[in-house]
């Protein structure tokens, strides 16, 4: 029996009931010239069922018995192969089931191709089996809001099956969709059965549907697109973080600097180092060292991790991140343990705002990356 | 098994015009897109521009509009790739790609262009 | 275009050891990520698409995870034949880009 299920998304009209959607593609049936074949369709709550064969309304004759969820083909030929479908029509929504038919003599066993993904993508469908169109890859299809930032690229997919081959063409906000109807138009591939619309703006709003069809049907999904305009601010960091950590002399440990910022952000890990057996410059201000900053040889930025620590790793480290805008900073402290002491729960250290509002990066060229003197900008 | 096999290194005067081949053996040709990717040496890898035969659709990267061309010979299972114009920067290796659902699957063995006067 | 940051550019390790490659898009590229390994002289070969989909005949140490903008490909034990070149590939817009690359050396 049939193992997967799907819904023709055939409204243009967001607010239509919820459909579900093929997965795979639909189980073939094979029988030989003259043989009986009888497939069950199995729809929960199936007020009334309706079968199609590719897209035509089956009704019952003198070799095709209906009775249920039965479908019975007496004395199958040729003829009778094809892409069939039962619908379960339910006030909240409906459901379809479909199956391919093939009457063969000859039964091999498929194609071997060395493929991957393929059936999603394009493939020239020959023969005489005449096939309304389908969806062939509905994961692809499944997000249908599109909230994107402005400038960003968005792509909607609708990747589709039949025979003869569909055609695809795109509406926006049931209107045919022109390239002249944005700057810089957009791009379709037939081949991927896709849109892309490249630096998205507030006009792109709206409501996009893709309408795949040929000559025994027609198909349908709709998108909703959001573009969401950029409101430039400084990285905000995830409260929290880093977090306190303790580890035994030997151990590893790591801190995590969760950052937001719709512009390219810059993050810095910053420790307290000493000079000359000093913490503090002749003017006060602390020798601070770059550990760790992102950039083209630096692997995830946003994680600091120690190996192998020692007593002189304890203390303070900062995430500096920064962008066009502004810059905010939060840090942790280290606790290093000896060896035969256990790390117990780690105790809360919030630094006085008084001390923090006094911090501020001093130069030094004795030490290799030591931050630029500048003042930090502590944000609650 | 699905193969790749394009034509032979190239050597180039700058201003000139090279045209690379990339023939498909082993599998449906019309039914996938192939792309075209260079490689200069030492450096990364840059995607240049794509035929969908069976659709008769091209796209090429902005770098390179104007100056290459994509064709396709459905009969012969080739596609071919013409850059113009050359410049000693073009010397790379080109490689044609079969995609498999937008992502290249299958590559081709690579054909060394040389620009130099 | 979408710009694709792969890092580190290189990295010296050990047969055995644990390899993370990260790259970053510079926009939501949903899960439209294949990563691919190149060695000197030869074509590129791949590895993993959709983000974390194995292709056929590929060793199952590598792994690939991520979503949105942030990806990693994942070497669970290092093999000899695992020193090479990998690539990121982005395919959510179809001016396709590639990361610039991250070189796996023997250290």
């Known amino acids: 029996r049939p193992s997967f299920s799907l819904v023709e998304d055939t409204t243009l009209e967001p607010e239509e009931p919820p459909t579900k959607y093929q997965i795979s593609q639909p189980e073939v049936y094979v029988a030989a010239p003259g043989e009986s074949l009888e497939v069950r369709c199995l729809l929960k709550d199936a007020a009334v069922i309706s079968w199609t064969k590719d897209g035509v309304h089956l009704g019952p004759n003198n070799r095709t018995v209906l009775i249920g969820e039965y479908l019975q083909i007496k004395g199958a030929t040729p003829r009778d192969s094809g892409l069939y479908a039962c619908t379960a029509t339910r006030t909240v929504d409906s459901e379809t089931w479909y199956f391919m038919v093939n009457v063969t003599d000859a039964i091999s066993s498929g194609d071997d191709e060395d493929d991957t993904d393929g059936a999603e993508d394009f493939v020239s469908e020959n023969g005489n089996n005449k096939r309304a169109p389908y969806w062939t890859n509905t994961e692809k299809m499944e997000k249908r809001l599109h909230a994107v930032p402005a400038a960003n690229t968005v792509k909607f997919r609708c990747p589709a099956g039949g025979n003869p081959t569909p055609t695809m063409r795109w509406l926006k906000n049931g209107k045919e969709f022109k390239q002249e109807h944005r700057i810089g138009g957009y791009k379709v591939r037939n081949q991927h059965w896709s849109l892309i619309m490249e630096s998205v703006v507030p006009s792109d709003k709206g409501n996009y549907t893709c309408v795949v069809e040929n000559e025994y049907g027609s198909i349908n999904h709709t998108y909703h697109l959001d573009v969401v305009e950029r409101s430039p601010h400084r990285p905000i960091l995830q409260a929290g973080l880093p977090a306190n950590a303790s580890t035994v002399v030997g151990g590893d440990v790591e801190f995590v600097c969760k950052v937001y910022s719709d512009a390219q952000p810059h993050i810095q890990w910053i420790k307290h180092v000493e000079k000359n057996g000093s913490k503090y410059g002749p003017d006060g201000l602390p020798y601070l060292k770059v550990l760790k900053h992102s950039g083209i040889n630096s692997s995830n930025a946003e994680v600091l991790a120690l190996f192998n620590v020692t007593e002189a790793d304890a203390g303070e480290y900062i995430c500096k991140v920064s962008n066009y805008i502004g810059q905010a900073n939060q840090s942790a402290w280290l606790t290093v343990l000896p060896k035969q002491q256990a790390p117990g729960r780690e105790k809360e250290i919030t630094a006085s705002p008084d001390y923090l509002e006094k911090l501020e990066f001093r130069h030094d060229s004795g030490l290799n990356d030591i931050f630029e003197a500048q003042k930090i900008e502590w944000h609650e | 098994q699905v193969q790749l096999v394009q034509s032979g290194a190239e050597v180039k005067k700058p201003g000139s015009s090279v045209k690379v081949s990339c023939k498909a053996s082993g599998g449906t040709f019309s039914s996938y897109a192939i792309s075209w990717v260079r490689q200069a040496p030492g450096q990364g890898l840059e995607w240049m521009g794509y035929?969908?035969?069976?659709?008769?659709?091209?796209h090429y990267a902005q770098k390179f509009q104007g100056r290459v061309t994509i064709t396709a010979d459905e009969s012969t299972s080739t596609a071919y790739m013409e850059l113009s114009s050359l410049r000693s920067e073009d010397t790379a290796v080109y490689y044609c790609?079969?995609?498999?659902?937008?992502?290249?699957?299958?590559w081709g063995q690579g054909t060394l262009v040389t620009v130099s006067s | 275009d979408i710009q694709m940051t792969q890092s580190p550019s290189s990295l010296s390790a050990s047969v055995g050891d644990r390899v993370t490659i990260t790259c970053r898009a510079s926009?939501?590229?949903?899960?439209?990520l294949a990563w691919y390994q190149q060695k000197p002289g030869k074509a590129p070969k791949l590895l993993i698409y959709?983000?974390?989909i194995l292709q056929s005949g590929v060793p199952s140490r590598f792994s690939g995870s991520g979503s949105g903008t942030d990806f990693t490909l994942t070497i669970s034990s290092l093999q000899p034949e695992d020193f090479a070149t990998y690539y990121c590939l982005q395919y959510y817009d179809y001016s396709y880009t590639f990361g610039q690359g991250t070189k796996v050396e023997i250290k």
């Open positions: 790609a079969r995609e498999s659902y937008e992502y290249f699957d299958i």
């Open positions: 035929i969908s035969p069976y659709m008769g659709e091209t």
């Open positions: 926009q939501s590229i949903s899960n439209d």
């Open positions: 959709a983000t974390s």
